[in-house]
Protein backbone atom coordinates (compact mmCIF):
# COMPACT_ATOMS: atom_id res chain seq x y z
CA UNK A 1 0.00 0.00 0.00
CA UNK A 2 1.14 3.63 -0.42
CA UNK A 3 2.35 5.11 2.25
CA UNK A 4 3.57 9.30 2.96
CA UNK A 5 6.69 9.54 3.02
CA UNK A 6 8.81 12.59 5.15
CA UNK A 7 12.36 13.22 5.63
CA UNK A 8 12.25 13.41 9.20
CA UNK A 9 11.59 11.96 12.50
CA UNK A 10 11.05 13.95 15.61
CA UNK A 11 11.77 11.61 18.25
CA UNK A 12 10.20 14.06 21.24
CA UNK A 13 6.74 13.98 20.07
CA UNK A 14 7.01 11.40 17.59
CA UNK A 15 5.74 13.46 14.58
CA UNK A 16 6.92 13.03 10.82
CA UNK A 17 8.34 16.31 9.55
CA UNK A 18 9.25 17.66 5.85
CA UNK A 19 6.74 15.87 3.79
CA UNK A 20 8.50 14.61 0.49
CA UNK A 21 5.47 13.36 -0.83
CA UNK A 22 2.65 10.27 -1.42
CA UNK A 23 2.07 7.43 -3.44
CA UNK A 24 5.54 5.86 -2.72
CA UNK A 25 6.26 2.38 -1.01
CA UNK A 26 7.17 1.56 2.73
CA UNK A 27 10.02 -0.06 1.30
CA UNK A 28 11.04 3.04 -0.98
CA UNK A 29 10.27 5.73 1.21
CA UNK A 30 12.80 3.71 4.14
CA UNK A 31 16.06 3.44 1.44
CA UNK A 32 16.94 6.01 3.75
CA UNK A 33 16.48 5.13 7.35
CA UNK A 34 16.28 8.89 8.75
CA UNK A 35 13.28 9.18 6.53
CA UNK A 36 9.46 8.41 8.20
CA UNK A 37 6.48 7.55 7.18
CA UNK A 38 2.65 7.73 7.89
CA UNK A 39 -0.13 4.45 6.36
CA UNK A 40 -2.78 7.73 6.30
CA UNK A 41 -3.02 11.78 6.50
CA UNK A 42 -2.97 12.42 10.73
CA UNK A 43 -1.91 8.55 11.16
CA UNK A 44 0.75 7.48 13.60
CA UNK A 45 3.56 8.55 12.29
CA UNK A 46 6.95 5.56 12.27
CA UNK A 47 10.40 6.24 11.37
CA UNK A 48 12.04 3.95 8.85
CA UNK A 49 15.06 3.04 11.89
CA UNK A 50 15.12 -0.44 12.92
CA UNK A 51 12.14 -0.51 16.21
CA UNK A 52 13.19 0.40 19.20
CA UNK A 53 10.56 1.79 22.27
CA UNK A 54 9.62 5.53 22.49
CA UNK A 55 9.84 7.36 25.54
CA UNK A 56 6.99 6.70 28.34
CA UNK A 57 4.31 9.26 27.89
CA UNK A 58 3.78 11.34 30.88
CA UNK A 59 1.36 10.01 33.52
CA UNK A 60 -2.64 10.47 32.75
CA UNK A 61 -4.50 12.44 35.04
CA UNK A 62 -5.82 10.04 37.86
CA UNK A 63 -8.50 8.23 37.30
CA UNK A 64 -10.44 10.20 40.06
CA UNK A 65 -10.19 13.74 41.60
CA UNK A 66 -10.00 12.85 45.20
CA UNK A 67 -9.25 9.63 47.51
CA UNK A 68 -7.28 6.67 45.79
CA UNK A 69 -7.43 5.92 41.79
CA UNK A 70 -4.78 4.62 39.28
CA UNK A 71 -3.46 6.39 36.24
CA UNK A 72 -1.77 5.09 32.99
CA UNK A 73 1.22 5.86 30.59
CA UNK A 74 2.22 4.10 27.77
CA UNK A 75 5.48 4.06 25.45
CA UNK A 76 4.81 2.71 22.17
CA UNK A 77 7.39 0.33 19.51
CA UNK A 78 8.64 2.66 16.72
CA UNK A 79 10.72 1.93 13.73
CA UNK A 80 10.24 -0.75 10.80
CA UNK A 81 11.08 -3.76 9.87
CA UNK A 82 11.89 -5.92 12.88
CA UNK A 83 10.37 -6.02 16.31
CA UNK A 84 10.94 -3.89 20.03
CA UNK A 85 12.08 -5.96 22.63
CA UNK A 86 9.91 -8.20 23.75
CA UNK A 87 9.30 -9.71 20.47
CA UNK A 88 6.97 -6.95 20.14
CA UNK A 89 5.71 -5.32 16.28
CA UNK A 90 5.77 -1.90 15.46
CA UNK A 91 2.90 0.34 16.64
CA UNK A 92 2.49 -1.91 19.83
CA UNK A 93 2.09 -0.05 22.99
CA UNK A 94 3.01 -1.26 26.56
CA UNK A 95 1.56 0.65 29.19
CA UNK A 96 2.38 0.70 33.25
CA UNK A 97 -0.41 1.36 35.65
CA UNK A 98 0.31 3.13 39.22
CA UNK A 99 -1.39 4.31 42.17
CA UNK A 100 -2.51 8.16 42.60
CA UNK A 101 -3.84 10.62 45.03
CA UNK A 102 -5.00 14.08 43.76
CA UNK A 103 -6.75 14.83 47.18
CA UNK A 104 -7.08 12.60 50.56
CA UNK A 105 -10.60 13.16 51.01
CA UNK A 106 -13.32 13.87 48.80
CA UNK A 107 -15.59 17.54 49.10
CA UNK A 108 -18.88 16.71 51.13
CA UNK A 109 -22.13 19.62 50.86
CA UNK A 110 -22.96 21.76 53.14
CA UNK A 111 -26.48 22.98 54.03
CA UNK A 112 -28.17 26.53 54.36
CA UNK A 113 -28.82 28.98 56.84
CA UNK A 114 -32.66 30.82 56.49
CA UNK A 115 -32.93 33.49 54.39
CA UNK A 116 -31.58 36.93 56.24
CA UNK A 117 -34.87 40.27 55.56
CA UNK A 118 -35.41 41.62 52.42
CA UNK A 119 -32.81 44.51 51.70
CA UNK A 120 -34.33 48.14 51.07
CA UNK A 121 -35.19 48.79 46.79
CA UNK A 122 -31.72 49.46 44.94
CA UNK A 123 -33.95 52.46 43.51
CA UNK A 124 -35.96 55.87 45.07
CA UNK A 125 -38.26 55.99 41.70
CA UNK A 126 -39.67 53.68 39.21
CA UNK A 127 -38.84 50.02 39.50
CA UNK A 128 -35.84 48.67 41.18
CA UNK A 129 -34.19 45.28 42.54
CA UNK A 130 -33.89 44.33 46.73
CA UNK A 131 -31.41 41.49 47.56
CA UNK A 132 -31.71 38.84 50.80
CA UNK A 133 -29.34 36.54 51.33
CA UNK A 134 -28.35 33.02 53.46
CA UNK A 135 -24.98 31.62 55.10
CA UNK A 136 -23.47 28.29 53.70
CA UNK A 137 -23.16 26.98 57.38
CA UNK A 138 -25.94 24.74 58.58
CA UNK A 139 -23.82 22.83 58.24
CA UNK A 140 -20.74 24.00 56.87
CA UNK A 141 -18.75 22.22 53.60
CA UNK A 142 -15.98 20.28 54.37
CA UNK A 143 -12.95 19.25 51.57
CA UNK A 144 -13.39 22.14 49.94
CA UNK A 145 -17.07 21.38 49.14
CA UNK A 146 -19.93 23.92 48.99
CA UNK A 147 -23.98 24.54 49.29
CA UNK A 148 -26.17 24.04 46.13
CA UNK A 149 -27.78 27.12 44.97
CA UNK A 150 -27.62 30.54 45.42
CA UNK A 151 -25.91 32.69 48.81
CA UNK A 152 -28.66 35.77 47.67
CA UNK A 153 -31.63 36.27 45.40
CA UNK A 154 -33.36 38.84 44.34
CA UNK A 155 -36.85 40.21 43.09
CA UNK A 156 -37.82 43.02 41.37
CA UNK A 157 -39.66 46.00 43.95
CA UNK A 158 -41.49 49.41 42.66
CA UNK A 159 -41.21 52.50 44.06
CA UNK A 160 -44.55 53.82 42.56
CA UNK A 161 -42.18 56.87 41.79
CA UNK A 162 -41.93 58.08 38.03
CA UNK A 163 -38.50 58.97 36.87
CA UNK A 164 -38.13 61.70 34.18
CA UNK A 165 -35.95 60.71 31.59
CA UNK A 166 -33.55 63.21 29.85
CA UNK A 167 -32.01 61.70 26.23
CA UNK A 168 -28.55 60.95 25.54
CA UNK A 169 -26.90 59.78 22.57
CA UNK A 170 -24.95 56.78 22.34
CA UNK A 171 -21.36 56.72 21.20
CA UNK A 172 -21.55 56.87 17.18
CA UNK A 173 -21.27 53.90 14.90
CA UNK A 174 -18.32 53.44 12.98
CA UNK A 175 -17.51 54.57 9.58
CA UNK A 176 -19.78 52.51 6.80
CA UNK A 177 -16.79 51.35 4.30
CA UNK A 178 -15.82 54.35 1.85
CA UNK A 179 -17.85 54.16 -1.54
CA UNK A 180 -15.07 53.14 -3.75
CA UNK A 181 -11.63 51.41 -2.70
CA UNK A 182 -9.05 53.33 -4.53
CA UNK A 183 -9.18 56.99 -6.70
CA UNK A 184 -9.65 57.52 -9.69
CA UNK A 185 -13.21 56.19 -10.13
CA UNK A 186 -16.45 57.99 -11.06
CA UNK A 187 -17.98 58.96 -7.73
CA UNK A 188 -16.23 60.81 -4.96
CA UNK A 189 -15.52 58.38 -1.94
CA UNK A 190 -17.78 58.82 0.79
CA UNK A 191 -18.18 57.50 4.53
CA UNK A 192 -20.97 57.89 6.86
CA UNK A 193 -21.56 56.99 10.37
CA UNK A 194 -24.24 57.54 12.43
CA UNK A 195 -25.46 57.48 16.22
CA UNK A 196 -29.28 56.68 18.09
CA UNK A 197 -30.76 58.83 21.02
CA UNK A 198 -30.57 55.96 23.00
CA UNK A 199 -28.44 56.06 25.87
CA UNK A 200 -30.85 56.83 27.47
CA UNK A 201 -34.24 57.55 25.45
CA UNK A 202 -35.88 60.55 25.92
CA UNK A 203 -39.21 59.66 28.56
CA UNK A 204 -42.47 60.91 27.33
CA UNK A 205 -44.16 61.35 31.19
CA UNK A 206 -42.73 62.98 32.60
CA UNK A 207 -41.16 64.20 29.61
CA UNK A 208 -37.55 64.30 29.48
CA UNK A 209 -35.18 66.46 26.64
CA UNK A 210 -34.48 65.22 23.16
CA UNK A 211 -30.98 65.17 22.25
CA UNK A 212 -28.83 67.72 20.74
CA UNK A 213 -27.36 67.52 17.23
CA UNK A 214 -27.43 65.96 14.06
CA UNK A 215 -27.76 61.24 14.21
CA UNK A 216 -25.37 61.19 11.29
CA UNK A 217 -22.11 62.87 9.87
CA UNK A 218 -20.27 62.67 6.44
CA UNK A 219 -16.94 63.02 5.10
CA UNK A 220 -14.73 62.62 2.43
CA UNK A 221 -12.51 59.15 1.98
CA UNK A 222 -8.50 60.19 2.04
CA UNK A 223 -5.45 58.18 1.62
CA UNK A 224 -6.88 56.03 -0.66
CA UNK A 225 -4.38 54.12 -3.08
CA UNK A 226 -4.61 53.86 -6.56
CA UNK A 227 -6.93 51.46 -7.99
CA UNK A 228 -4.66 47.89 -8.18
CA UNK A 229 -3.53 45.61 -10.90
CA UNK A 230 -3.42 41.64 -10.21
CA UNK A 231 -0.17 39.81 -10.83
CA UNK A 232 -0.21 36.54 -13.05
CA UNK A 233 2.04 33.93 -13.50
CA UNK A 234 5.26 33.33 -16.09
CA UNK A 235 5.93 29.88 -17.39
CA UNK A 236 7.73 26.82 -15.47
CA UNK A 237 11.08 27.52 -15.34
CA UNK A 238 13.49 23.90 -15.56
CA UNK A 239 13.04 20.94 -13.16
CA UNK A 240 15.87 21.69 -10.89
CA UNK A 241 18.07 17.97 -10.46
CA UNK A 242 17.32 15.43 -8.05
CA UNK A 243 19.72 16.57 -4.81
CA UNK A 244 20.00 13.16 -3.52
CA UNK A 245 22.73 10.40 -4.11
CA UNK A 246 20.46 7.81 -2.34
CA UNK A 247 16.48 6.69 -1.51
CA UNK A 248 14.23 9.73 -1.86
CA UNK A 249 14.27 13.17 -3.12
CA UNK A 250 12.76 16.31 -4.24
CA UNK A 251 13.13 17.64 -7.37
CA UNK A 252 11.46 21.62 -7.92
CA UNK A 253 10.41 24.13 -10.45
CA UNK A 254 9.90 27.77 -10.37
CA UNK A 255 7.73 30.25 -11.88
CA UNK A 256 7.56 34.27 -11.16
CA UNK A 257 5.03 36.15 -10.68
CA UNK A 258 6.06 38.92 -13.66
CA UNK A 259 3.31 38.74 -16.56
CA UNK A 260 2.46 41.37 -15.21
CA UNK A 261 3.66 42.10 -11.56
CA UNK A 262 0.91 42.81 -9.22
CA UNK A 263 0.94 46.60 -8.75
CA UNK A 264 -0.28 49.09 -6.54
CA UNK A 265 -1.81 46.85 -4.27
CA UNK A 266 -3.40 43.90 -6.70
CA UNK A 267 -3.43 40.43 -5.50
CA UNK A 268 0.29 38.29 -5.82
CA UNK A 269 -0.58 35.41 -7.98
CA UNK A 270 -2.89 32.95 -7.07
CA UNK A 271 -1.46 29.43 -6.40
CA UNK A 272 2.48 28.32 -5.85
CA UNK A 273 5.52 29.80 -7.03
CA UNK A 274 7.45 25.70 -6.83
CA UNK A 275 6.15 22.74 -7.91
CA UNK A 276 7.97 19.75 -6.33
CA UNK A 277 7.99 16.01 -7.80
CA UNK A 278 10.12 12.96 -5.98
CA UNK A 279 12.77 11.80 -7.24
CA UNK A 280 14.18 8.07 -6.69
CA UNK A 281 17.68 6.70 -6.89
CA UNK A 282 16.62 3.23 -5.81
CA UNK A 283 19.98 3.11 -4.16
CA UNK A 284 19.85 2.46 -0.16
CA UNK A 285 21.20 4.81 1.81
CA UNK A 286 24.26 4.03 4.44
CA UNK A 287 22.58 2.59 7.90
CA UNK A 288 24.81 3.50 11.00
CA UNK A 289 25.77 0.42 13.10
CA UNK A 290 24.47 0.60 17.03
CA UNK A 291 25.36 -0.76 19.74
CA UNK A 292 22.68 -3.37 21.12
CA UNK A 293 22.47 -3.34 25.25
CA UNK A 294 25.36 -5.37 27.20
CA UNK A 295 25.30 -8.55 28.05
CA UNK A 296 25.23 -10.34 30.87
CA UNK A 297 28.64 -9.94 33.11
CA UNK A 298 31.03 -13.63 32.44
CA UNK A 299 31.27 -15.42 35.65
CA UNK A 300 33.90 -13.90 38.19
CA UNK A 301 36.99 -16.36 38.08
CA UNK A 302 40.30 -16.05 38.51
CA UNK A 303 43.14 -17.93 35.74
CA UNK A 304 44.65 -21.08 37.01
CA UNK A 305 41.85 -21.17 39.95
CA UNK A 306 39.26 -23.68 40.05
CA UNK A 307 36.89 -21.23 42.42
CA UNK A 308 37.36 -18.11 43.77
CA UNK A 309 33.94 -18.10 45.35
CA UNK A 310 33.56 -16.72 48.84
CA UNK A 311 37.05 -15.96 49.33
CA UNK A 312 39.04 -12.44 49.79
CA UNK A 313 40.25 -12.82 45.75
CA UNK A 314 39.65 -10.51 43.35
CA UNK A 315 38.96 -12.15 39.87
CA UNK A 316 38.36 -10.95 36.43
CA UNK A 317 34.65 -10.78 34.42
CA UNK A 318 33.41 -9.63 30.93
CA UNK A 319 30.41 -8.91 28.90
CA UNK A 320 30.26 -8.01 25.53
CA UNK A 321 28.04 -6.20 23.32
CA UNK A 322 26.53 -6.70 19.58
CA UNK A 323 27.01 -4.19 16.60
CA UNK A 324 23.83 -4.37 14.93
CA UNK A 325 22.11 -3.19 11.91
CA UNK A 326 25.24 -1.72 9.97
CA UNK A 327 24.05 -1.61 6.46
CA UNK A 328 25.30 -0.58 2.70
CA UNK A 329 28.67 1.04 3.98
CA UNK A 330 27.23 2.92 7.06
CA UNK A 331 29.82 3.71 9.92
CA UNK A 332 31.01 0.91 12.56
CA UNK A 333 29.69 1.09 16.11
CA UNK A 334 32.36 3.27 18.38
CA UNK A 335 33.74 2.12 21.40
CA UNK A 336 34.82 -0.90 22.53
CA UNK A 337 32.88 -4.44 22.04
CA UNK A 338 34.22 -5.96 25.38
CA UNK A 339 34.23 -4.21 28.52
CA UNK A 340 36.27 -5.98 31.31
CA UNK A 341 36.18 -5.24 35.21
CA UNK A 342 37.65 -6.81 38.70
CA UNK A 343 35.12 -8.65 40.95
CA UNK A 344 35.03 -10.84 44.02
CA UNK A 345 32.78 -13.43 43.48
CA UNK A 346 29.72 -14.36 46.31
CA UNK A 347 28.01 -16.83 44.16
CA UNK A 348 25.91 -19.03 46.25
CA UNK A 349 27.90 -17.66 49.31
CA UNK A 350 26.21 -18.32 52.65
CA UNK A 351 25.95 -14.74 54.34
CA UNK A 352 24.57 -13.19 57.16
CA UNK A 353 21.52 -11.11 55.94
CA UNK A 354 19.11 -8.25 57.72
CA UNK A 355 15.50 -7.25 56.22
CA UNK A 356 15.30 -4.38 54.39
CA UNK A 357 12.33 -1.39 55.18
CA UNK A 358 9.46 -1.81 52.79
CA UNK A 359 9.80 -1.19 48.96
CA UNK A 360 7.89 1.80 47.50
CA UNK A 361 4.78 0.61 46.08
CA UNK A 362 5.32 -0.87 42.67
CA UNK A 363 3.22 -0.59 39.67
CA UNK A 364 -0.19 -2.00 39.28
CA UNK A 365 -0.30 -5.10 37.48
CA UNK A 366 -1.51 -6.33 34.48
CA UNK A 367 -2.11 -2.49 33.59
CA UNK A 368 -4.41 -3.61 30.69
CA UNK A 369 -6.50 -6.56 32.24
CA UNK A 370 -9.21 -7.46 35.40
CA UNK A 371 -8.38 -6.77 39.30
CA UNK A 372 -4.70 -4.85 38.80
CA UNK A 373 -2.90 -5.18 42.08
CA UNK A 374 0.44 -3.76 43.40
CA UNK A 375 3.00 -4.76 45.89
CA UNK A 376 5.68 -4.23 48.13
CA UNK A 377 8.68 -6.22 49.39
CA UNK A 378 11.27 -6.47 52.62
CA UNK A 379 14.12 -8.54 51.47
CA UNK A 380 16.37 -10.70 53.55
CA UNK A 381 19.58 -8.90 52.00
CA UNK A 382 23.01 -9.84 52.27
CA UNK A 383 25.71 -8.18 54.27
CA UNK A 384 29.00 -8.18 52.15
CA UNK A 385 31.94 -8.92 53.40
CA UNK A 386 34.10 -6.18 54.19
CA UNK A 387 36.91 -6.39 51.39
CA UNK A 388 39.03 -4.26 49.91
CA UNK A 389 37.02 -2.00 47.69
CA UNK A 390 40.37 -1.67 45.42
CA UNK A 391 42.90 -3.78 44.15
CA UNK A 392 46.25 -3.33 42.06
CA UNK A 393 46.72 -6.18 39.78
CA UNK A 394 49.66 -5.43 37.69
CA UNK A 395 52.43 -2.99 38.81
CA UNK A 396 52.48 0.23 37.78
CA UNK A 397 48.86 -0.10 36.45
CA UNK A 398 47.37 2.17 39.53
CA UNK A 399 44.55 1.03 41.78
CA UNK A 400 41.30 -0.82 40.50
CA UNK A 401 37.73 -0.72 41.56
CA UNK A 402 36.68 -4.34 42.53
CA UNK A 403 32.58 -4.78 42.15
CA UNK A 404 30.97 -7.94 44.54
CA UNK A 405 29.65 -10.08 41.67
CA UNK A 406 26.58 -13.34 41.90
CA UNK A 407 23.96 -14.32 43.63
CA UNK A 408 24.85 -15.09 47.36
CA UNK A 409 22.10 -17.21 49.86
CA UNK A 410 21.22 -14.38 52.58
CA UNK A 411 20.15 -15.91 55.93
CA UNK A 412 17.91 -13.99 58.33
CA UNK A 413 16.09 -14.56 60.62
CA UNK A 414 11.97 -15.60 59.75
CA UNK A 415 9.71 -12.68 59.62
CA UNK A 416 5.88 -13.33 59.15
CA UNK A 417 7.02 -17.16 58.44
CA UNK A 418 9.27 -16.39 55.66
CA UNK A 419 13.06 -16.74 55.06
CA UNK A 420 14.00 -14.55 52.13
CA UNK A 421 11.04 -11.93 50.60
CA UNK A 422 7.73 -10.74 52.58
CA UNK A 423 5.51 -9.69 49.82
CA UNK A 424 2.09 -7.06 50.75
CA UNK A 425 0.07 -6.88 47.84
CA UNK A 426 -3.31 -4.33 47.28
CA UNK A 427 -5.90 -3.69 44.82
CA UNK A 428 -5.47 -1.02 42.39
CA UNK A 429 -8.84 1.09 42.49
CA UNK A 430 -11.03 2.98 39.53
CA UNK A 431 -8.79 1.31 36.65
CA UNK A 432 -8.46 3.49 33.76
CA UNK A 433 -9.05 1.62 30.28
CA UNK A 434 -6.26 1.02 27.87
CA UNK A 435 -6.80 3.31 24.99
CA UNK A 436 -4.64 3.85 22.23
CA UNK A 437 -4.19 7.76 21.69
CA UNK A 438 -4.17 7.47 18.33
CA UNK A 439 -7.60 5.67 17.85
CA UNK A 440 -8.83 8.43 19.92
CA UNK A 441 -8.30 11.11 17.08
CA UNK A 442 -9.76 9.16 14.79
CA UNK B 1 -5.12 -23.46 31.19
CA UNK B 2 -7.64 -22.49 28.67
CA UNK B 3 -9.61 -24.60 25.74
CA UNK B 4 -11.03 -22.84 22.37
CA UNK B 5 -13.35 -24.45 20.60
CA UNK B 6 -14.55 -22.98 17.46
CA UNK B 7 -18.28 -23.63 15.48
CA UNK B 8 -20.67 -22.44 12.99
CA UNK B 9 -17.82 -22.81 9.71
CA UNK B 10 -20.29 -24.31 6.71
CA UNK B 11 -20.84 -24.05 2.63
CA UNK B 12 -22.58 -20.84 1.83
CA UNK B 13 -23.01 -18.77 -1.47
CA UNK B 14 -21.66 -15.72 -1.48
CA UNK B 15 -23.35 -12.50 -0.59
CA UNK B 16 -25.06 -15.26 2.36
CA UNK B 17 -23.80 -14.51 6.18
CA UNK B 18 -22.71 -16.85 8.96
CA UNK B 19 -21.87 -16.55 12.85
CA UNK B 20 -18.81 -18.39 13.94
CA UNK B 21 -18.67 -18.97 17.93
CA UNK B 22 -15.77 -19.76 20.15
CA UNK B 23 -16.81 -21.44 23.41
CA UNK B 24 -13.86 -21.48 26.18
CA UNK B 25 -13.82 -23.60 29.30
CA UNK B 26 -11.27 -23.53 31.65
CA UNK B 27 -10.99 -20.00 32.60
CA UNK B 28 -13.59 -16.86 32.09
CA UNK B 29 -13.00 -15.40 28.60
CA UNK B 30 -14.33 -11.86 29.90
CA UNK B 31 -11.06 -11.21 30.98
CA UNK B 32 -8.92 -12.04 28.05
CA UNK B 33 -8.44 -10.16 24.55
CA UNK B 34 -9.80 -12.29 21.90
CA UNK B 35 -8.97 -12.37 17.94
CA UNK B 36 -10.32 -13.71 15.21
CA UNK B 37 -7.76 -15.31 12.25
CA UNK B 38 -8.10 -17.16 9.08
CA UNK B 39 -5.86 -19.07 6.84
CA UNK B 40 -6.66 -20.58 2.93
CA UNK B 41 -4.82 -23.14 1.67
CA UNK B 42 -1.10 -22.68 0.62
CA UNK B 43 -1.98 -18.98 2.33
CA UNK B 44 0.10 -17.48 5.09
CA UNK B 45 -2.39 -17.04 8.27
CA UNK B 46 -4.39 -13.55 8.42
CA UNK B 47 -5.58 -11.25 10.89
CA UNK B 48 -9.23 -10.85 10.42
CA UNK B 49 -10.70 -9.49 13.95
CA UNK B 50 -9.85 -8.50 17.51
CA UNK B 51 -11.84 -7.45 20.54
CA UNK B 52 -9.67 -5.43 23.65
CA UNK B 53 -10.72 -7.45 27.53
CA UNK B 54 -12.93 -4.36 28.28
CA UNK B 55 -14.23 -4.35 24.63
CA UNK B 56 -12.95 -0.83 24.69
CA UNK B 57 -11.48 -0.96 21.21
CA UNK B 58 -12.29 -3.57 18.55
CA UNK B 59 -10.02 -4.01 14.92
CA UNK B 60 -10.96 -5.47 11.62
CA UNK B 61 -8.58 -6.57 8.79
CA UNK B 62 -9.33 -3.95 5.80
CA UNK B 63 -10.48 -6.62 4.28
CA UNK B 64 -13.78 -7.36 6.23
CA UNK B 65 -14.30 -4.00 7.76
CA UNK B 66 -17.88 -3.01 7.72
CA UNK B 67 -19.23 -6.99 6.87
CA UNK B 68 -17.48 -8.79 9.55
CA UNK B 69 -18.44 -7.84 13.55
CA UNK B 70 -16.87 -9.32 16.43
CA UNK B 71 -18.24 -9.60 19.37
CA UNK B 72 -18.82 -11.77 23.07
CA UNK B 73 -21.27 -12.76 25.66
CA UNK B 74 -19.09 -13.12 28.97
CA UNK B 75 -22.49 -15.17 30.39
CA UNK B 76 -21.92 -17.80 27.80
CA UNK B 77 -18.04 -17.32 27.84
CA UNK B 78 -18.26 -17.16 24.20
CA UNK B 79 -17.01 -14.80 21.53
CA UNK B 80 -18.77 -14.53 17.83
CA UNK B 81 -17.59 -13.49 14.35
CA UNK B 82 -20.52 -11.91 13.01
CA UNK B 83 -19.96 -12.70 8.49
CA UNK B 84 -22.16 -10.69 6.54
CA UNK B 85 -21.97 -10.51 2.10
CA UNK B 86 -19.41 -13.40 2.36
CA UNK B 87 -17.64 -13.44 -0.85
CA UNK B 88 -15.28 -16.36 -2.15
CA UNK B 89 -12.26 -14.98 -0.88
CA UNK B 90 -13.57 -15.36 2.48
CA UNK B 91 -12.96 -19.05 1.69
CA UNK B 92 -10.51 -20.41 4.37
CA UNK B 93 -10.01 -22.27 7.80
CA UNK B 94 -11.16 -19.29 10.98
CA UNK B 95 -9.14 -19.57 14.23
CA UNK B 96 -9.90 -17.90 17.51
CA UNK B 97 -7.31 -17.40 19.95
CA UNK B 98 -6.92 -15.74 23.06
CA UNK B 99 -4.18 -13.17 24.94
CA UNK B 100 -3.42 -13.38 28.63
CA UNK B 101 -4.21 -10.22 30.66
CA UNK B 102 -0.83 -8.09 29.91
CA UNK B 103 1.10 -4.88 29.43
CA UNK B 104 0.89 -3.98 25.88
CA UNK B 105 -1.96 -3.35 23.40
CA UNK B 106 -2.59 -1.40 19.72
CA UNK B 107 -4.14 -2.50 16.71
CA UNK B 108 -0.73 -3.61 15.51
CA UNK B 109 -0.28 -6.25 18.31
CA UNK B 110 -3.57 -7.50 18.16
CA UNK B 111 -2.98 -8.43 14.38
CA UNK B 112 0.14 -10.28 15.38
CA UNK B 113 -0.53 -14.40 16.01
CA UNK B 114 2.43 -14.26 18.08
CA UNK B 115 0.35 -12.41 20.66
CA UNK B 116 -2.19 -14.69 21.26
CA UNK B 117 -1.34 -17.77 24.02
CA UNK B 118 -4.59 -19.82 23.30
CA UNK B 119 -5.92 -20.99 20.34
CA UNK B 120 -8.21 -23.31 18.73
CA UNK B 121 -8.43 -25.91 16.33
CA UNK B 122 -10.28 -24.20 13.68
CA UNK B 123 -13.35 -24.03 11.50
CA UNK B 124 -13.83 -24.13 7.75
CA UNK B 125 -15.79 -22.09 6.07
CA UNK B 126 -16.56 -22.08 2.00
CA UNK B 127 -18.07 -19.35 -0.03
CA UNK B 128 -19.09 -20.82 -3.72
CA UNK B 129 -19.88 -18.04 -6.26
Known amino acids: DPVLCFTQYEESSGKCKGLLGGGVSVEDCCLNTAFAYQKRSGGLCQPCRSPRWSLWSTWAPCSVTCSEGSQLRYRRCVGWNGQCSGKVAPGTLEWQLQACEDQQCCPEMGGWSGWGPWEPCSVTCSKGTRTRRRACNHPAPKCGGHCPGQAQESEACDTQQVCPTHGAWATWGPWTPCSASCHGGPHEPKETRSRKCSAPEPSQKPPGKPCPGLAYEQRRCTGLPPCPVAGGWGPWGPVSPCPVTCGLGQTMEQRTCNHPVPQHGGPFCAGDATRTHICNTAVPCPVDGEWDSWGEWSPCIRRNMKSISCQEIPGQQSRGRTCRGRKFDGHRCAGQQQDIRHCYSIQHCPLKGSWSEWSTWGLCMPPCGPNPTRARQRLCTPLLPKYPPTVSMVEGQGEKNVTFWGRPLPRCEELQGQKLVVEEKRPCLHVPACKDPEEEEL | QVRLVESGGGLVQAGDSLRLSCAAS????????MGWFRQAPGKEREFVAATTWRDTSTYYADSVKGRFTISRDNAKNTVYLQMNSLKPEDTAAYYCAAEEPSKYSGRDYYMMGDSYDYWGQGTQVTVSS
Open chain 2, 26 to 33: GRTLSSYA
